[in-house]
């Protein structure tokens, strides 16, 4: 039960995380005009990975796409790549994890196969989360560098010539969405990896070996946490361990409403 919950929760957390990564990648507010200690302009500038926007004080907003690939900074290209890799890995991870979910039955899929799939999706989520966090962090670092450079330029004018006031940019909402989303995807991936350990069957987990002593029978399960002792010959149907491993009779059960999505 705990394994199923961990796996399910990991899936949901990763799903939210990946949705957040996609949202952050599409958002226009990666960097927003710094309004603090800056000559106040009647327009508000903000930029995303794909386009830059200007909001007039009237509320009219105009966005322009970056219609060039070669003319863009290498760092921006790198951030785009990291975010896309994160989304692709996350999407594949989600697809794999759907089939790996313990509550979903697909034919006669072995638990060992589900465990492997859970581990695979978990690793994919971890890498996806790391890609997103890395992408957002690289962009944030770029912003910080540019912010202080433009601040320096603001105060070292052109020696009496026309002074240009540079628009400084600070962290936009997308950065925070990206960091949180990356973190959630990472956590979801870790949870999937933890769930995998509980799912992974040890060879003996499914075979209850009975040792018959005179007078009473003891069912001993080498891989389990409990040794069940009982009188009579009821050992075959006895539920030995409720942590996911089952006796042979229990393995085959009727489909319930939770078996299909």
């Amino acid at each position: 039960m705990a394994v199923t919950a961990c796996q399910g929760l990991g899936f949901v957390v990763s799903l939210i995380g990946i949705a957040g990564i996609i949202a952050a990648t599409c958002m226009d507010q990666w960097s927003t005009q710094d309004l603090y200690n800056n000559p106040v302009t009647a327009v508000f500038n903000y930029q995303g990975l794909w386009r830059s926007c200007v909001r007039e004080s009237s509320g009219f907003t105009e966005c322009r796409g970056y219609f060039t690939l070669l003319g863009l900074p290498a760092m921006l290209q790198a951030v785009r790549a990291l975010m896309i890799v994160g989304i692709v890995l996350g999407a594949i991870g989600l697809l794999v994890s759907i089939f790996a979910l313990k509550c979903i039955r697909i034919g006669s899929m072995e638990d060992s196969a589900k465990a492997n799939m859970t581990l695979t999706s978990g690793i994919m989520f971890i890498v996806s989360g790391l890609c997103a966090i890395a992408g957002v962090s690289v962009f944030a670092n770029m912003l910080v560098t540019n912010f202080w450079m433009s601040t320096a330029n603001m105060y070292t004018g052109m020696g009496g010539m026309v002074q240009t006031v540079q628009t400084r940019y600070t962290f936009g909402a997308a950065l925070f969405v990206g960091w949180v989303a990356g973190g959630l995807t990472l956590i979801g991936g870790v949870m999937m990896c933890i769930a995998c350990r509980g799912l992974a069957p040890e060879e003996t987990n499914y075979k209850a070996v009975s040792y018959h002593a005179s007078g009473h029978s003891v069912a001993y399960k080498p891989g389990g946490f409990k040794a069940s002792t009982g009188f009579g010959s009821n050992t075959k149907n006895k539920k030995i361990y409720d942590g996911g491993a089952r006796t042979e009779d229990e393995v085959q059960s009727y489909p319930s409403k939770h078996d299909y999505v």
């Epitope: 000559p39 106040v40 302009t41 009647a42 327009v43 500038n45 903000y46 930029q47 830059s52 926007c53 200007v54 007039e56 004080s57 009237s58 509320g59 009219f60 105009e62 322009r64 026309v162 002074q163 240009t164 006031v165 628009t167």
Partner: antibody, heavy 119, light 113 residues
Framework: QVQLQQPGTELVKPGASVKVSCKAS????????MHWVKQRPGQGLEWIGR????????NYNQKFKGKATLTVDKSSDTAYMQLNSLPSEDSAVYYC????????????WGQGTLVTVSA | DIVMTQSPSSLTVTAGEKVTMTCKSS????????????VTWYQQKPGQPPKLLIY???TRESGVPDRFTGSGSGTDFTLTISSVQAEDLAVYYC?????????FGSGTKLEIR
């Protein structure tokens, strides 16, 4: 069509206050900024400030802070500018102007109110 | 505050002539975000309120005759009237509508011979 109606003249005594009105018609009053501009006789134009009727958010020229107060009455689609403790050099034509949608320019202007400060 | 310097302060021309007036700002009025210059030109005829002619330095307001052309970028801007008509007698103001407070130039008075 867009119209901004202002009273033609206001005569006030030095040190007194005056409230200049600007009644808007022909457009959605709450959707556009209302600007106020001062023009002394034979002189250039000076931006006083602006107010957004939807939420009364405003920006002032530092020079006119404390001198001018911008307000709106949404129920009557009217913008007001109160000028306090007027000296004779505040005698001027005061225009209200509707902000444009696409840019920050002033698309339509009222005819102006001549405020005369005289004893 | 941004200083808008207009020149000449006045000029007298004959109808049909081409006229050019300039406006220089103390800081760049080009917004990098949308590559637009936030300069507006107004025409004020005697006894009338100003009228919007050109915004974003070069975009003509609807209804404005195409003999009026705005150009320039950064700090230097120009208003050109390709063929002056008698009704163009007015004072022309340029305005910074990028930085607060919005500021106007001192105006160029156009007189017809």
């Amino acid at each position: 069509q867009v119209q901004l109606q202002q009273p033609g003249t206001e005569l006030v005594k030095p040190g007194a206050s005056v409230k200049v009105s600007c009644k808007a018609s022909g457009y959605t009053f709450t959707s556009y900024w209302m600007h106020w501009v001062k023009q002394r006789p034979g002189q250039g134009l000076e931006w006083i400030g602006r107010i957004r009727p939807s939420d009364s958010d405003s920006n002032y020229n530092q020079k006119f802070k404390g001198k001018a107060t911008l307000t709106v009455d949404k129920s009557s689609d009217t913008a007001y500018m109160q000028l306090n403790s007027l000296p004779s050099e505040d005698s001027a034509v005061y225009y209200c102007a509707m902000g444009a949608y696409f840019s920050n320019s002033f698309a339509y202007w009222g005819q102006g109110t001549l405020v005369t400060v005289s004893a | 505050d941004i200083v808008m310097t207009q020149s000449p302060s006045s000029l007298t021309v004959t109808a049909g002539e081409k006229v050019t007036m300039t406006c220089k700002s103390s800081q760049t009025l080009l917004n990098r975000g949308n590559q637009k210059n936030y300069v507006t030109w107004y025409q004020q005829k005697p006894g009338q309120p100003p009228k919007l002619l050109i915004y974003w330095a070069s975009t003509r307001e609807s209804g404005v005759p195409d003999r009026f052309t705005g150009s320039g970028s950064g700090t230097d801007f120009t208003l050109t009237i390709s063929s002056v008509q008698a009704e163009d007698l007015a004072v022309y103001y340029c305005q910074n509508d990028y930085f607060f407070p919005f500021t106007f130039g001192s105006g160029t008075k156009l007189e017809i011979r």
